[in-house]
């Protein structure tokens, strides 16, 4: 019962987590910026992995997608890749875990198969969660190290002067959604792995039978006979371990499983 509950809860937690990872990946608010140098109206800029948006206090909002792939910062591409890998692994994990659920019967699937599937999905959820956490953390680090406060450096460029706009870059809501979602997926994966241990059938204690030679060094002789060691009589030259059922006349006897020790 506890195993079923752990597995079921792990599945639900992972499902919520993966839904969160998808939501975070699609959200526009990964980075938010207040543009200070505008004397007209408050301008709020926010960016996601796929597009950038400008919102003004007047109500005007416009978003534009990053249509190019080659020109974008490598770090953005890396974050995109991590999030997509996380979603794909999570989706496959969910699919596998549905069939692995103890409460769902599919044909005559054994518990050992369900245990393996539960472990597989658990590992997938853990990797998925780690990918999401890594992706969000890489983006957050990019904001902290490069953009936290762009100073107004002025320099001359072609066509006149250029200056960086003094903006304050802050963490967007998507980062927090991503962190929480990644954590939930990770926790769900761990729960699935724990459930797997309970699902795995108990190891069968097979009775091991050991056979021992009667003498010190039993030499094998052609014809299926064994030579005496000199300790003990064995004068009738009977086959050892054969219960004395056959004599030397039964030369063409087939070797039994006891003949080779």
């Amino acid at each position: 019962m506890a195993v079923t509950a752990c597995q079921g809860l792990g599945f639900v937690v992972s499902l919520i987590g993966i839904a969160g990872i998808i939501a975070a990946t699609c959200m526009d608010q990964w980075s938010t910026q207040d543009l200070y140098n505008n004397p007209v109206t408050a301008v709020f800029n926010y960016q996601g992995l796929w597009r950038s948006c400008v919102r003004e206090s007047s109500g005007f909002t416009e978003c534009r997608g990053y249509f190019t792939l080659l020109g974008l910062p490598a770090m953005l591409q890396a974050v995109r890749a991590l999030m997509i890998v996380g979603i794909v692994l999570g989706a496959i994990g969910l699919l596998v875990s549905i069939f692995a659920l103890k409460c769902i019967r599919i044909g005559s699937m054994e518990d050992s198969a369900k245990a393996n599937m539960t472990l597989t999905s658990g590992i997938m959820f853990i990797v998925s969660g780690l990918c999401a956490i890594a992706g969000v953390s890489v983006f957050a680090n990019m904001l902290v190290t490069n953009f936290w406060m762009s100073t107004a450096n002025m320099y001359t460029g072609m066509g006149g002067m250029v200056q960086t706009v003094q903006t304050r870059y802050t963490f967007g809501a998507a980062l927090f959604v991503g962190w929480v979602a990644g954590g939930l997926t990770l926790i769900g994966g761990v729960m699935m792995c724990i459930a797997c241990r309970g699902l795995a059938p108990e190891e069968t204690n097979y009775k091991a039978v050991s056979y021992h030679a009667s003498g010190h060094s039993v030499a094998y002789k052609p014809g299926g006979f064994k030579a005496s060691t000199g300790f003990g009589s064995n004068t009738k030259n009977k086959k050892i371990y054969d219960g004395g059922a056959r004599t030397e006349d039964e030369v063409q006897s087939y070797p039994s499983k006891h003949d080779y020790v």
């Epitope: 543009l35 109206t41 800029n45 950038s52 990053y66 974008l72 762009s150 066509g159 200056q163 960086t164």
Partner: nanobody, 122 residues
Amino acid sequence: QVQLVESGGGLVQPGGSLRLSCAASGSIFLINAMGWVRQAPGKGLEWVAVITRGGSANYADSVKGRFTISRDNSKNTLYLQMNSLRAEDTAVYYCNADLNLRSDPFKWYTFWGQGTLVTVSS
């Protein structure tokens, strides 16, 4: 590389009109606010007018009611319609634009043009 090129300046009589244009070109991702700043001979920079991407405009008190700023987002072009010009409007007019580049859509820059000279004299 981004370039802002002003045009439309020249000599005009007091009370006359001029229309300045500023065309932005290059690897621009998104232009936010655009504006005009002027520098009269021997004086410092004076802010004239600014317009956001959404069309919200603001003017310096000295030009209110006489100048009109507008923009065409699809062409990345800024305009300044100057009416009832006075001698004190004589200056080099610079256009500037807050924008980000295709290669770095997470960072905002203000680019400035080389300027166009407007002379108001009889």
